[in-house]
Amino acid sequence: MAFSGSQAPYLSPAVPFSGTIQGGLQDGLQITVNGTVLSSSGTRFAVNFQTGFSGNDIAFHFNPRFEDGGYVVCNTRQNGSWGPEERKTHMPFQKGMPFDLCFLVQSSDFKVMVNGILFVQYFHRVPFHRVDTISVNGSVQLSYISFQNPRTVPVQPAFSTVPFSQPVCFPPRPRGRRQKPPGVWPANPAPITQTVIHTVQSAPGQMFSTPAIPPMMYPHPAYPMPFITTILGGLYPSKSILLSGTVLPSAQRFHINLCSGNHIAFHLNPRFDENAVVRNTQIDNSWGSEERSLPRKMPFVRGQSFSVWILCEAHCLKVAVDGQHLFEYYHRLRNLPTINRLEVGGDIQLTHVQT
């Protein structure tokens, strides 16, 4: 089963910015541009989906202008010549304010969402598959540009039978307490390729890292516990962390922590003594409010193997256990790249970790 990973995001790129869209645009690709409109200089900024770096061929020019009450221009440029402008005379951006700008490529059009509301659809004037570059210029500061690959793979029954290079997909967020979710989420990002697979040599306590190749699925020697490793580059939208192991027969609790300095950005704490999966954040040694709700019964079982997939998105972490989406945990610590340490401890035996 071939699997195409999502492109790694561009983090805090300087403006003006031009970057390659790996594999070009494809139907279902979602591109998120997250940043802040500068309050001082300039009255315009633009996001361009173009061919090459010259700027002569722009399939989609998205151009907010803080002029004449504010409006947004959409256009296409072919061989250096602009076509007729499409203007939206409403301004969803505010000077000095952050924004969340999301583009969805579809067969007939680009759909653009700004701050959670569909803002405009722009019908293709040129074939979108020609686009291989995104550029941003003007009065804006960027936090990141991320990509969510449209390709998905079927939901697997459990990771334990599947190499991690073929991960499951998150189904849609469960919406009722009774029904199962209706299928595979269509815009699911795949784990990116800059992963590190942590394996263990026969000498206890020694670890080495290998490139992201499909790991052999033979039993590994046990990982040292507690297990601590660095997450290279920290978290960012589309980043995945994969773990598998076995719960000890007499287990009371275990934890998976994603840490930022002295803070625990995400504490995943299955508790067999309470039949609960507790999630929380600890900042300056102070715990926040616990989250415990689950769409189904406790997925971890004493004495049984398990797999956990943690997928980072812009607003939240999505967590799947044994190939089934379990919950979302919305970021309480927002500086994602600083969340760069994984700690696992408690009553389990780890068999595989991929960061």
């Epitope: 304010m97 700004v114 959670g116 509301i117 569909l118 803002f119 659809q121 812009a314 309480r332």
Partner: antibody
Amino acid sequence: EVQLVESGGGLVQPGGSLRLSCAASGFTVSSSSIHWVRQAPGKGLEWVAYIYPYSGYTSYADSVKGRFTISADTSKNTAYLQMNSLRAEDTAVYYCARYSTYSKWVWGMDYWGQGTLVTVSS
Amino acid sequence: DIQMTQSPSSLSASVGDRVTITCRASQSVSSAVAWYQQKPGKAPKLLIYSASSLYSGVPSRFSGSRSGTDFTLTISSLQPEDFATYYCQQSYYDSNPITFGQGTKVEIK
């Protein structure tokens, strides 16, 4: 379990002020847009305002612009609607609702509060 | 503003009937339309999102469709618990990014 609970409604005189609260549990308000929708007695639904706490963006219906202010306190996981210069026509049940967090490309308000009644009368 | 013109404003039907409610948007709103059911004294409940997707837990007799700027909610076989008021809602950014239809009250014949 996701829940939204409104409070702060009551009887107020024309020209007066009220602050409505929408306490969220089961999710964080910073993860989604939060909307206020009202319904006058015997009438239909009217959208009032929304906030996208992740970016701080706010938007208002023309009928309340300049009088109402929507805000969110992410540490308290609560959204607010500050209503000033209230008029008789603002009398309604006010609901807060969450826009779906299922995917950015899903359109619908999936969870609503039970509503709080605001009566503007002398 | 984008107007959502909903029709009919009310209808009488019997259990087992097929019921169709329509909303016409005054301009293109893509598929950014939802349908809600509201019963007296209660908050609205989401039935259909993104024009045609059935919300989890909603019976399959409810369906939504889109044709251009026309949106339709269909109840294939009306049940006693379906007597309520139904609203369409668009969320396509305009001066008011959210607007509701006027509502359709479905009553027992």
